[in-house]
Interface confidence: low
């Protein structure tokens, strides 16, 4: 056997070139024929009607040609015949690869809550062969679940995604990618997250700056509350006790003007949105005010003093309104 | 709320290279797509390509070849680059928090290629 | 050339009911988003997903979509609502694609 041909694999759309060769030629006739055992080359010449077939090379040891625009139904068994004594005869199979017509992706719903399980499908539609789906939030990879639905030698390959979305998923993209030996790069497609939660509250002592309230000071606290929606609702209470009289509240901040030891207690920034509620505290201790010593008639002395602030902050940044998680900074 | 502000040069002459750079404030940077989208003087827009915080581009096809987004994480900033422009390159630029849809947008800086 | 395609130019009556449309392949799968310009002024989102408005967008704005169509109506315009409208989608290799854009004129 001297006559020798390769297989092909060729993108729909795309060229095949089939090649007939002969090892230690003897001139004899070569001939190409198609699935159907028509014949598309006698040697140079072309009986076939079909002028998507072109004469790439024709010598003695090899007959070379072109097939453009191919389509699946060119797929199959393309029969090289070496007119010897006796014929011989070798084969080369044409496989047409189809990359899918559409990436569609379709997610359960626009706005989802945190903690819910939404549904995420991703379908590559009619490709050969079956096209692998890999989903991505961001840049993790997740594990979906695909079916395979054939029809006429393409397949239709759906991925379903069980995603529980979380706050930090918000704005992230959910990412369907497809593998497929007729896609060069990624050919991906994308949906934003967009999820509600609930607010994250945070109350920052605005005043006085370094943190020790005295007696007939002023202070100051904010309350930062951040959610999604934003929180349409943040009000500061007194935890188990009357606002003092000569409190001010103003929006998100809270001021005491002239600060007595009655004040002490603890002090709730409350913020809620349709998610949920969330609430952080503030411990106000009172200190004495600062005690002056008249200076001695003889000497001078400098006295000084060392003051450790304790700053106590309780954060509840659950859904309700029972119970705490209470992390204590020192 | 997030804002974008944009900055660049307005004014250049072909073949030089285009520089604008975008800022976010008030709003989560990583997690997001951030683009640029130019619109000729009465003319509609054009999408030029997009970024995320972690330096993943896409880019239009017809401008990629001419195009480079950058971005500066820790600042909170993207940046384009668009090298050898001519005067069909003249066109308001704008930033914008990419996604399926662009929004919110940076204010827009007109930029004019003239010798 | 864009593969959205929108009517160049639409005129609507103080007070009646107008149709913005907008045509391409990538609406068979994805609905539109939609932009409000007016001039001078950067583009405002008005309608995402299947008929969402941001905050701010009064509710005469709306969207819908049928087949390889988006559909932005505004139903009683106001003078304020001339202005640019353009359609927004990605197409099958992720890349953004605006539609050509409409001119609204309120007579």
């Known amino acids: 056997q001297n006559l020798f041909t390769k297989d092909v694999t060729v993108i729909e759309g795309e060229v095949a070139t089939i090649s007939c060769q002969v090892n230690k030629s003897d001139d004899s006739v070569i001939q190409l024929l198609n699935p159907n055992r028509q014949t598309i080359y006698f040697r140079d010449f072309r009986p076939l009607k079909d002028s998507r077939f072109q004469l790439l090379n024709f010598s003695s040891s090899e007959l070379k040609v072109s097939l453009t625009n191919v389509s699946i139904s060119d797929e199959g068994r393309y029969f090289c015949q070496l007119y010897t004594d006796p014929p011989q005869e070798s084969y080369t199979t044409i496989t047409v690869l189809v990359p899918p017509r559409n990436l569609m992706i379709d997610i359960q719903k626009d706005t989802a809550v945190e903690g819910e399980e939404i549904e995420v499908n991703c379908t590559a539609m009619a490709s050969k062969p079956a096209t692998t789906i890999r989903w991505f939030k961001g840049n993790t990879e997740l594990k979906g679940k695909s079916e395979v639905e054939e029809w006429s030698d393409m397949y239709t390959v759906t991925s379903q995604l069980m995603l529980k979305v979380h706050k930090e998923d918000d704005g992230v993209p959910v990412i369907c990618q497809v593998e497929h030996p007729a896609v060069t790069g990624n050919l991906q497609t994308q949906r934003y997250l967009e999820v509600q939660y609930k607010p994250q509250v945070h109350i920052q002592m605005t005043y006085p700056l370094q943190g020790l309230t005295r007696e007939g000071d002023a202070l100051e606290l904010t309350c930062e509350a951040i959610g999604k929606p934003q929180p349409v609702m943040v009000t500061w209470v007194r935890v188990d006790d009357e606002m003092p009289q000569h409190a001010v509240l103003s929006g998100p901040n809270l001021f005491i003007n002239n600060l007595n030891k009655t004040d002490n207690g603890t002090y709730r920034c409350e913020a809620s949105n349709i998610v949920g509620k969330a609430h952080s505290d503030y411990m106000l201790y009172v200190y004495d005010p600062p005690t002056t010593i008249p200076p001695p008639t003889t000497t001078t002395t400098t006295t000084t003093t060392t003051t450790t602030t304790i700053l106590t902050i309780i954060t509840d940044s659950r859904a309700g309104e029972e119970g705490s998680i209470r992390a204590v900074d020192h | 709320q997030v804002q974008l502000q944009q900055w660049g040069a307005g004014l250049l002459k072909p073949s030089e290279t285009l520089s604008l750079t975008c800022a976010v404030y008030g709003g989560s940077f990583g997690g997001y797509y951030w683009g640029w989208i130019r619109q000729p003087p009465g003319k509609g827009l054009e999408w030029i390509g997009e970024i995320n915080h972690s330096g993943s581009t896409n880019y239009n096809p017809s401008l990629k070849s001419r195009v480079t987004i950058s971005v500066d994480t820790p600042k909170n900033q993207f940046s384009l680059k668009l090298s050898s422009v001519t005067a069909a390159d003249t066109a308001v630029y704008y930033c914008a928090r990419g996604g399926w849809y662009p929004d919110p947008w940076g204010q827009g800086t007109l930029v004019t290629v003239s010798s | 050339s864009s593969e959205l395609t929108q009517d160049p130019a639409v005129s609507v009556a103080l007070g009646q009911t107008v149709r913005i449309t907008c045509q391409g392949d990538s609406l068979r799968s994805y609905y539109a988003s939609w932009y409000q310009q007016k001039p001078g002024q950067a583009p405002v989102l008005v309608i995402y997903g299947k008929n969402n408005r941001p905050s701010g967008i009064p509710d005469r704005f709306s969207g819908s979509s049928s087949g390889n169509t988006a559909s932005l109506t505004i139903t009683g315009a106001q003078a304020e609502d001339e202005a640019d409208y353009y359609c927004?989608?990605?197409?099958?290799?992720?890349?953004?694609?605006f539609g050509g854009g409409t001119k609204l004129t309120v007579l």
């Open positions: 927004n989608s990605r197409d099958s290799s992720g890349n953004v694609v």
